[in-house]
């Protein structure tokens, strides 16, 4: 019945690890909706067999009928595929031998190399595993104090996964928490277990509770929502830098500039010139030259610091760290000092064009 | 090899409706969100809605809102867009696409639908 | 809804050339972005997603990084086959946006 091979998904682990793992790729075992299906477990000298789906122990019910190495599934549905395992346990060790069973409507021709990267929150769990509610990606919920300023968006996820799949409601502050509670209400997106609430206010600070819950038991994770006002104010640089700098001709040197601003700001690195032998022009206002500003091949981390190479003496200068946003501007500047290299001679090089700007 | 498969081009007039099908083969459906997304000619790609077979949700961009319904058949593994009330700046390819976690990372070959008079 | 502002909006480059793209979100985003590739007549195809996750099959050379708003998608050496349009994705807010694109042709 095998009809292609499929990359074992390495991220779903029986309940008992075995002591040794199939190294071929599982088989696959397709079937139609409504048709039955009869596996043999592939393992020798199996004594005492289990099985598995999804990692989740499987028991004969109505439909699933366990006799010695064979399973059957009767009248097979869609929530039947999955990862199936069958575990050999011996008094010295135990082996587990995988398979995969695909119930769809067509059949499948190859290689699903875009579906192995196990990132799906949502698991049809097998009708016949009961399982209490469990989280099954704790990674998305290890931040639990949500500092945000006022008009984002937010969103708290609480993947979970159960049998039967279990609910998920929301709490504030303990109380059930109602669309009617705050202006444009919320979102809540049961296929990925999250709640979002756009353009957040003060009012929705507090503590957002989801309760994931079915028969079996009920969970529950508390997020804290800190409502950061925005203050309009033009960008705020760290003071003391960038700092003064000096080195020798030929060697390295950086400036770093912190900036700080609630309004998206824009950075740029600008070096005061000399003009005609003048650093200011006929209106007063001196000659700069931007050497670095944000675009293509920066982000704001990287404007933060502006290096020289290979320094010249005609690096030399004033250099400034300008950073404006939508309220206004905010410049700090630092100074270069070029040092003779020891031994060698003042370098005099031409100077190059420069714009008034 | 997990497949979504969408129905042909259409030529509509200004103020009808179109309807896309989108039919996916080769996986369970309805453990998946189906995302609707549009290009108009030379331009970028733009979101219009999803819907969550298995949980029963649908959600549409702001834009969209009252002109675009999307559906689903389980039966059939098919999900449906239709828009209304269409207009010559509508004329584009809609695509379909599979949400695995929250990205899209299948999508349908794309129907293109020419709204003119 | 975030605004997903990509730049620069086309670039000419060589084989062999290292390209980088940005992407800037108008709010943090976490890390909840994907970058597509789209060829002419094509769909667009998932290169990168949870901003540096490698979809599978997608070649070693595409790299992605950042967090909060600011994030880069790097081809360290471009390849003929690389030539398209790459469009970031955020999937942060269920309001999903993409960036405008960005045209990568031929020098």
């Known amino acids: 019945r095998p009809s292609f091979s499929l990359v074992e998904d390495t991220t779903l682990e029986p309940e008992e690890p075995p002591t040794k793992y199939q190294i071929s790729q599982p088989e696959v075992y397709v079937a139609a909706p409504g048709e039955s299906l009869e596996v043999r477990c592939l393992l020798k000298d199996a004594a005492v067999i289990s099985w598995t789906k999804d990692g989740v122990h499987l028991g004969p019910n109505n439909r699933t009928v366990l006799i010695g190495e064979y399973l059957q599934i009767k009248g097979a549905t869609p929530r039947d595929s999955g990862l199936y395992a069958c575990t050999a346990s011996r008094t010295v060790d135990s082996e587990t031998w995988y398979f995969m069973v695909n119930v769809t409507d067509a059949i499948s021709s190859g290689d699903d190399e875009d579906d192995t990267d196990g990132a799906e929150d949502f698991v049809s769990e097998n009708s016949n595993n009961k399982r209490a509610p469990y989280w099954t990606n704790t990674e998305k919920m290890e931040k639990r104090l949500h500092a945000v300023p006022a008009a984002n968006t937010v969103k708290f996820r609480c993947p979970a996964g159960g049998n039967p799949m279990p609910t998920m409601r929301w709490l504030k502050n303990g109380k059930e928490f109602k669309q009617e509670h705050r202006i444009g209400g919320y979102k809540v997106r049961n296929q990925h277990w999250s709640l979002i609430m756009e353009s957040v206010v003060p009012s929705d600070k507090g503590n957002y509770t989801c309760v994931v819950e079915n028969e079996y038991g009920s969970i529950n994770h508390t997020y804290h929502l800190d409502v950061v006002e925005r203050s309009p104010h033009r960008p705020i640089l760290q003071a003391g830098l960038p700092a003064n700098a000096s080195t020798v001709v030929g060697g390295d040197v950086e400036f770093v500039c912190k900036v700080y601003s609630d309004a998206q700001p824009h950075i740029q690195w600008i070096k005061h010139v000399e003009k005609n032998g003048s650093k200011y022009g006929p209106d007063g206002l001196p000659y700069l030259k931007v050497l670095k500003a944000a675009g293509v091949n920066t982000t704001d981390k990287e404007i933060e610091v502006l290096y020289i190479r290979n320094v010249t003496f005609e690096d030399a200068g004033e250099y400034t760290c300008l950073a404006g946003n939508s309220i206004g501007i905010s410049f700090h500047s630092a100074w270069l000092t070029v040092l003779p290299a020891p031994g060698r001679e003042k370098e005099i090089t031409a100077s190059p064009d420069y714009l008034e700007i | 090899q997990v497949q979504l498969v969408q129905s042909g081009a259409e030529v509509k007039k200004p103020g009808s409706s179109v309807k896309v099908s989108c039919k996916a083969s080769?996986?369970?459906?309805?453990?998946?969100?189906i995302s609707w997304v549009r290009q108009a000619p030379g331009q970028g790609l733009e979101w219009m809605g999803y819907i969550s077979p298995y949980m029963g949700e649908t959600h549409y961009a702001q834009k969209f809102q009252g002109r675009v319904t999307i559906t689903a058949d389980e039966s059939t593994s098919t999900a449906y867009m239709e828009l209304s009330s269409l207009r010559s700046e509508d004329t584009a390819v809609y695509y379909c696409a599979r949400e695995s976690y929250e990205y899209f990372d299948i999508w349908g070959q794309g129907t293109l639908v020419t709204v003119s008079s | 809804d975030i605004q997903m502002t990509q730049s620069p909006s086309s670039l000419s480059a060589s084989v062999g050339d290292r390209v980088t793209i940005t992407c800037r979100a108008s709010q943090s985003i976490s890390n909840d972005l994907a970058w597509y590739q789209q060829k002419p007549g094509k769909a667009p195809k998932l290169l990168i997603y949870?901003?540096?996750i490698l979809q599978s099959g997608v070649p070693s050379r595409f790299s992605g990084s950042g967090s909060g708003t600011d994030f880069t998608l790097t081809i360290s050496s471009l390849q003929p086959e690389d030539f398209a349009t790459y469009y970031c994705?955020?999937?942060?807010?269920?309001?999903?946006?993409f960036g405008q694109g960005t045209k990568v042709e031929i020098k």
């Open positions: 994705l955020q999937y942060y807010d269920y309001s999903y946006t």
């Open positions: 949870a901003t540096s």
């Open positions: 080769g996986g369970t459906f309805s453990s998946y969100a």
